[in-house]
Interface confidence: low
């Protein structure tokens, strides 16, 4: 039976959602157990001209041995104005200077990236050392980098379409996911459903999708329902600030008990199929539904309420 | 092309010194890790000691077997490397070949062999 | 430190014959690196990051491995085969080499 509820963009203030992942569009980690030098390389394309970026370097023990160096690679396309924060790490960081500023002192050795292509910037750092990992982002708003991390399956760091960069790097765009919204006709009440859809990403480990739920509307006023859908492969830490009812794909567990999982239910894995559960759960509109690639940490703020859907 | 030529080698008495150069051409010299590594008569290969580009303010790094004792420089507007060799011991006899480090050892130089004996 | 140990020492084959030589790491590293040496030669670089050959490198040589355990293969040995291969690592400090394999005519 076909679910009629059309599903559009909601205006950002009725809800936004953020989120961090692994996923690239391009990437690689490579091996490295105990490298002397960690050579990364991160490719940043800002569409909208210039922009600001949080950068974060965290370094790890490896078998009780910090790196010896590592050496960071910033290509941008445009003018950046980067907060670095890399305690500790005996960085060297090569990037183009006329294109990025430094909020602060940087603190680190810096060097003059030549202005090459890819291929050839790519060249240039395994000239340093071999590559641990590389990185094309698109549009990112903060990146974390961590150290001591790599567990690549390649011996060498070679560019390839669609990665997910594991462990090693996370990053959260500055455009946040498109969140749609629609009434589903026929049901009567207030009872609201948010809906998340992971996506399943390029490697299947099991992962923990943190999810955070921001409503802003008295407890007494919400009669809503999460519904988290993702690969098998995906479990669930809720985070939220209001009691609502919770209906998973995988097992779930709360913030504030999360030792204690709970199992979750077979969900249907396509659009309509997460709408017609949000109709069987009585819901009468669905307040947020979004699709996302997969992601560990997923930031939902709704002002809906169980009121009027406003669609931008 | 990548060229490299060692000298300086020849008879030394143990404690004593000597100092090895290492000609290079063909490339950025600058931009390069460059290492020492040894080869005592019928043995195998031993690495000495590296030092590295001007991006990364020229580090060095040595064999425990050397460390102490020799030391590794550079001149990049000469586009030379040196390895200064004191305390010199018997053990330390061999040829020496200064190499490029770019992902592995690329280019190594003919070798100069070094003699410390009494 | 990574003691590399090559096995064998020495191998005494014919023209036309499969050789395999092992390098066995004392832990993990990341990739190997395989140089050929020829007597009152300096080496040359023969297979770089564990598979891939150096430039100039016949086809018949092949290089495998991971973690501990890495080989060099030569598919059918040819008379300027005869050498002595050697493995390095540095993916921990300090460098070191494997003892070497010395392929000869039988």
């Known amino acids: 039976e076909t679910v009629h509820c059309d599903l559009q963009p909601v205006g950002p203030e009725r809800g936004e959602v953020t989120y961090t992942t692994s996923q690239v569009s391009k990437g690689c980690v490579a091996q490295a157990p105990n490298a002397i030098l960690e050579v990364h390389v991160l490719f940043l394309e800002f569409p909208t001209g210039p922009s600001q970026l949080e950068l974060t370097l965290q370094a790890s023990k490896q078998n009780g041995t910090w790196p010896r160096e590592v050496l960071l690679v910033l290509s941008v396309n445009s003018s950046v104005f980067l907060h670095l924060q890399a305690l500790g790490i005996p960085l060297h960081l090569a990037y183009n200077s006329s294109l990025v500023t430094f909020q602060e002192p940087p603190g680190v050795n810096t060097t003059e990236l030549p202005s090459f292509p890819k291929t050839q910037i790519l060249e240039w750092a395994a000239e340093r050392g071999p590559i641990t990992s590389a990185a094309e982002l698109n549009d990112p708003q903060s990146i974390l980098l961590r150290l001591g991390q790599a567990q690549g399956s390649l011996s060498f760091c070679m560019l390839e379409a669609s990665q997910d960069m594991g462990r090693t790097l996370e990053w959260r765009p500055r455009t946040p996911a498109l969140v749609r919204g629609c009434h589903l006709e026929g049901v009567a009440g207030h009872k609201e459903a948010h809906i998340l859809r992971v996506l399943p990403g390029h490697s299947a480990g099991p992962r923990t999708v943190t999810v955070k739920v921001e409503l802003s509307c008295a407890p007494g006023d919400l009669d809503a329902v999460l519904i988290l859908q993702g690969p098998p492969y995906v479990s669930w830490l809720i985070d939220a600030n209001h009691n609502m009812q919770i209906w998973t794909t995988g097992e779930y567990s709360f913030k504030i008990f999360p030792e204690k999982n709970i199992r979750g239910f077979k969900l249907p894995d396509t659009p309509q199929g997460l709408l017609g559960e949000a109709r069987m759960l009585n819901a009468s509109i669905v307040a947020s539904f979004v699709e996302l690639p997969l992601a560990s940490i997923v930031s939902l703020h709704a002002s809906s309420c169980g009121g009027r859907l406003q669609t931008s | 092309e990548v060229q490299l030529v060692e000298s300086g080698g020849g008879l030394v008495k143990p404690g004593g010194s000597l100092r090895l150069s290492c000609a290079a051409s063909?490339?950025?010299?600058?931009?390069?890790?460059m290492d020492w590594v040894r080869q005592a008569p019928g043995k195998g290969l031993e690495w000495v000691g590296e030092?590295?580009?001007?991006?990364?303010?020229?580090?060095?790094y040595y064999a425990e077997s050397v460390k102490g004792r020799f030391t590794i420089s550079r001149d990049d507007s000469k586009n030379t490397l040196y390895l200064q060799m004191n305390s010199l011991k018997t053990e330390d006899t061999a040829v020496y070949y200064c190499?490029?480090?770019?992902?592995?050892?690329?280019?190594w130089g003919q070798g100069t062999l070094v003699t410390v004996s009494s | 430190d990574i003691q590399l140990t090559q096995s064998p020492s020495s191998l005494s084959a014919s023209v036309g014959d499969r050789a395999t030589i092992t390098c066995r790491a004392s832990?993990?590293?990341?990739?190997m690196h395989w140089y050929q040496q020829k007597p009152g030669k300096a080496p040359k670089p023969w297979i770089y990051?564990?598979?891939n050959l150096a430039s100039g490198v016949p086809s018949r040589f092949s290089g495998s491995g991971s973690g501990t355990d890495y080989t060099l293969t030569i598919s059918s040995l040819q008379p300027e085969d005869f050498a002595t291969y050697y493995c390095?690592?540095?993916?921990?400090?300090?460098?070191?080499f494997g003892g070497g394999t010395k392929v000869e005519i039988k």
């Open positions: 190499t490029r480090w770019r992902r592995f050892f690329d280019s």
């Open positions: 063909g490339f950025t010299f600058s931009d390069a890790w």
């Open positions: 030092i590295r580009s001007q991006a990364s303010n020229h580090a060095t």
């Open positions: 832990s993990s590293v990341s990739y």
């Open positions: 990051a564990s598979s």
């Open positions: 390095q690592q540095w993916s921990s400090n300090p460098l070191t």
